[in-house]
Interface confidence: low
């Protein structure tokens, strides 16, 4: 790969909609990994420190953000759906982890975010207690 | 897969305060429904994928649309797909 063209993903977790929770008694978290090149990524969901597969659906392949460009950056999305009760338990911790290849290991992004969402190379959310 | 009780809906999801990306989730729609790519290059729409909540014996179709455009709205995110008019559920303002 041309290392000059390596761009790491930005990773963000989006909280479930309260409308979905009240309408379906289920909660869908969405993880977005955006702006990366090349398209070698692996996305996984971790709940309370354990990798989960049930309730997860990830795009089969990354999406070109600008389809007309030969060397367009890529995006990938994934959904994790849990019961409303599970989401509302504030002890539950949800983490979307994206592995990206081609970066030297001393690159880092340390911007802090308010909980319940933290955006890093991985992103996480905490279950929300009822207000 | 066969979706037992399709209940198509579009929900707006909230990211962190400093995140300028808006995300819309189109979910629980029938398998015959197709999701079209956006004609707007600043709006990204995924293909539909199937999610299986094995512990609840529940499967659902879903697709995600997102954009950094300030005027991007979930009401029009999937406008190029043929979806029922009453599928958009506005999110109540959080009182937390």
């Amino acid at each position: 790969e041309d290392l000059k063209k390596v761009f790491p993903p930005k990773v963000a977790v989006f909280e479930p909609s309260e409308a979905e929770i009240s309408h379906t008694q289920k909660a869908t978290l969405v993880c977005l990994a955006t702006g990366f090149y090349p398209d070698h990524v692996e996305l996984s969901w971790w709940v309370n420190g354990k990798e989960v597969h049930s309730g997860v659906s990830t795009d089969p392949q990354p999406l070109k953000e600008q389809p007309a460009l030969e060397d367009s950056r890529y995006s990938l999305s994934s959904r994790l759906r849990v019961s409303a009760t599970f989401w509302h338990n504030p002890r539950n911790h949800f983490r979307c982890q994206v592995q990206f290849y081609g970066l030297s290991e001393d690159d880092e992004w340390t911007e802090d975010r308010d909980k319940p969402i933290t955006q890093k190379i991985s992103a996480e959310a905490w279950g929300r207690a009822d207000c | 897969p066969y979706i037992q009780n399709p209940d198509p809906a579009v929900y707006q999801l909230r990211g962190s305060k400093s995140n300028d990306t808006s995300v819309c989730l189109f979910t629980d729609f029938d398998s015959v429904m197709n999701v079209s790519q956006s004609k707007d290059s600043d709006v990204h729409i995924t293909d539909k994928t199937v999610l299986d909540m094995r512990s609840m014996d529940f499967k659902s179709n879903g697709a995600v649309a997102w954009s950094n455009k300030s005027d991007f709205a979930c009401t029009s995110a999937f406008k190029d797909s043929v979806i029922p008019a009453d599928t958009f559920f506005p999110s109540p303002e959080s009182s937390c």
């Epitope: 971790w46 420190g49 983490r95 190379i121 991985s122 | -």
Partner: nanobody, 117 residues
Framework: EVQLVESGGGVVQPGGSLRLSCVAS????????YGWYRQAPGKEREKVAH???????DYADSAKGRFTISRDESKNTVYLQMNSLRPEDTALYYC???????????WGQGTLVTVSS
């Protein structure tokens, strides 16, 4: 960058005990998850135990009832207490941490445990 240093390995007789320690060179609040893994000669690396935020723990079947993972945030240290050791527990034991900043997946160099009479 996080550095993980394991210690506590050694030679022990079957039925004996060892306590492995893993010290992180970084504030523990930046680490979401710790794990102990092991690799026996000629075999693949396998999970032994995990501990995550809220001290939620998870054990491999082979470790249940015999091994205990714990951590001491004040010392930035995670422990693996191993009791009733068996010859098949002989392996190189590695500590792993998942942190909140890149590169988020860290491994120690390993500490050797030999169970032999």
């Amino acid at each position: 960058e996080v550095q993980l240093v394991e210690s506590g390995g050694g030679v022990v007789q079957p039925g004996g005990s060892l306590r492995l320690s893993c010290v992180a060179s970084w504030e523990v609040h930046k680490i979401n998850f710790y794990g102990w893994y092991r690799q026996a000669p000629g075999k693949e690396r396998e999970k032994v135990a995990h501990i995550s935020i809220g001290d939620q723990t998870d054990y491999a079947d082979s470790a249940k009832g015999r091994f205990t993972i714990s951590r001491d945030e004040s010392k930035n240290t995670v422990y693996l207490q191993m009791n009733s050791l068996r010859p098949e527990d002989t392996a190189l034991y590695y500590c792993r941490a998942l942190s909140r900043i890149w590169p988020y997946d860290y491994w120690g160099q390993g500490t050797l445990v030999t169970v032999s009479s």
